[in-house]
């Protein structure tokens, strides 16, 4: 039975050209995490495997950094980075847990005028 829950940073915004940390946390379960996949829509961004460590997908190598922890740092943000991001926890024995984060990348001027939001 899957008892765990994923807590995420929820809906976040960041400035174009800046960076943002995507963070998920699995709680309320004793399941062991074998691997965490980070995906944008259906595209793989990165993998953190308990045995083999981190892998950043080739198309994102220049702009994605592993961590902190099981999180992911997106750098040099563009408006095209706006969208849904998913952390997928592969665990034993529970199975798969998925968390969702919505990122909005704003033009710097808009962000400076207080349009930044964060919903837990």
């Amino acid at each position: 039975m899957m008892t765990g829950t994923i807590e995420t940073t929820g809906n976040i915004s960041a400035e174009k050209g800046g960076s943002i940390i995507l963070q998920c946390h699995l709680s309320s379960t004793t399941a062991q995490v074998t691997q965490v996949n980070w995906e944008q829509q259906d595209q793989l961004l990165a993998i953190c495997n308990a045995d083999l460590g981190w892998h950043i997908s080739p198309s994102f190598k220049d702009r994605v950094a592993p961590g902190p922890g099981l999180g992911l740092t997106l750098q040099s943000l563009t408006v095209n980075d706006t969208g849904e991001y998913f952390c997928i926890y592969h665990t034993y024995p529970d199975g798969t847990y998925t968390g969702r984060i919505f990122l909005e990348v704003l033009e710097s001027s808009v962000a400076e005028h207080g349009a930044r939001f964060q919903i837990p």
């Epitope: 074998t34 691997q35 996949n37 793989l44 993998i47 495997n49 045995d51 083999l52 460590g53 892998h55 997908s57 080739p58 592969h90 034993y92 024995p93």
Partner: antibody
């Protein structure tokens, strides 16, 4: 269509060398852990070696350690197995295999195999 | 070295249900070890062909594999069940598991399934 195509097998004398290649197509090669698995005539499957996404981590079966070297060229979507100091017991069909995105889950795509015969 | 043990042969008649067992030493399946020791996969090898993945992650079926094939796992033992047996199911079946302690994959010896 996801495909793996092995080549490089043949007849070699004991003590000789051979390099097997596996050309991958239909998937983002860089994002997957790969393995070589062999099958001696009339026998079962035996795992030979595994390589991570970048090639920085490699594992070997005890029976080939120190003699075989696994490598990959992600720019060419190709997996290799360099086999040195070959013995009669290395005679087998050699398969390359793509792992599931969580590599511990299993090997989801296999090539058709290439035959290696070690004999004088 | 860890070992996965399978019966060398199994048989059944068309329409029947057959199960193939795969028992392992504690370190490659038993639940008291860390997660990457636990995943059992099953492969079908028809005569003269490459192996094909039937079950991954103990119980998951890849797309395209009929739901007649199912996997289960309990403690140090895993099992592949085939229901509604068909003549084309006649093949060798192999279980495998990642052995995290040894950083290696271990295959069972294989089971030859005969459809009578």
């Amino acid at each position: 269509e996801v495909q793996l195509l092995e080549s490089g097998g043949g007849l070699v004398q004991p003590g000789g060398s051979l390099r097997l290649s596996c050309a991958a197509s239909g998937f983002t090669f860089d994002d997957y852990v790969m393995s070589w698995v062999r099958q001696a005539p009339g026998k079962g499957l035996e795992w030979v070696s595994l390589i991570n996404w970048s090639g920085g981590t490699t594992y070997y079966a005890d029976s080939v350690k120190g003699r075989f070297t696994i490598s990959r060229d992600n720019s060419k979507n190709t997996l290799y197995l360099q086999m040195n100091s070959l013995r009669a017991e290395d005679t087998a069909v050699y398969y390359c295999a793509k792992h599931w995105i969580v590599y511990q889950y299993g090997m989801d795509v296999w090539g058709q195999g290439t035959t290696v015969t070690v004999s004088s | 070295q860890s070992v996965l043990t399978q019966p060398s042969s199994a048989s059944g008649t068309p329409g029947q249900r057959v199960a193939i067992s795969c028992s392992g030493t504690i370190s490659n399946i038993e639940t008291k070890y860390v997660s990457w020791y636990k995943y059992v996969s099953w492969y079908q090898q028809l005569p003269g062909t490459a192996p094909k993945l039937l079950i991954y992650n103990n119980v998951q079926r890849p797309s395209g594999v009929p739901d007649r094939f199912s996997g289960s796992q309990s403690g140090t033992s895993a099992s592949l069940a085939i229901s509604g047996l068909q003549s084309e199911d006649e093949a060798h079946y192999y279980c495998a598991s990642w052995e995290g302690g040894l950083n290696s994959w271990v295959f069972g010896g294989g089971t030859k399934l005969t459809v009578l």
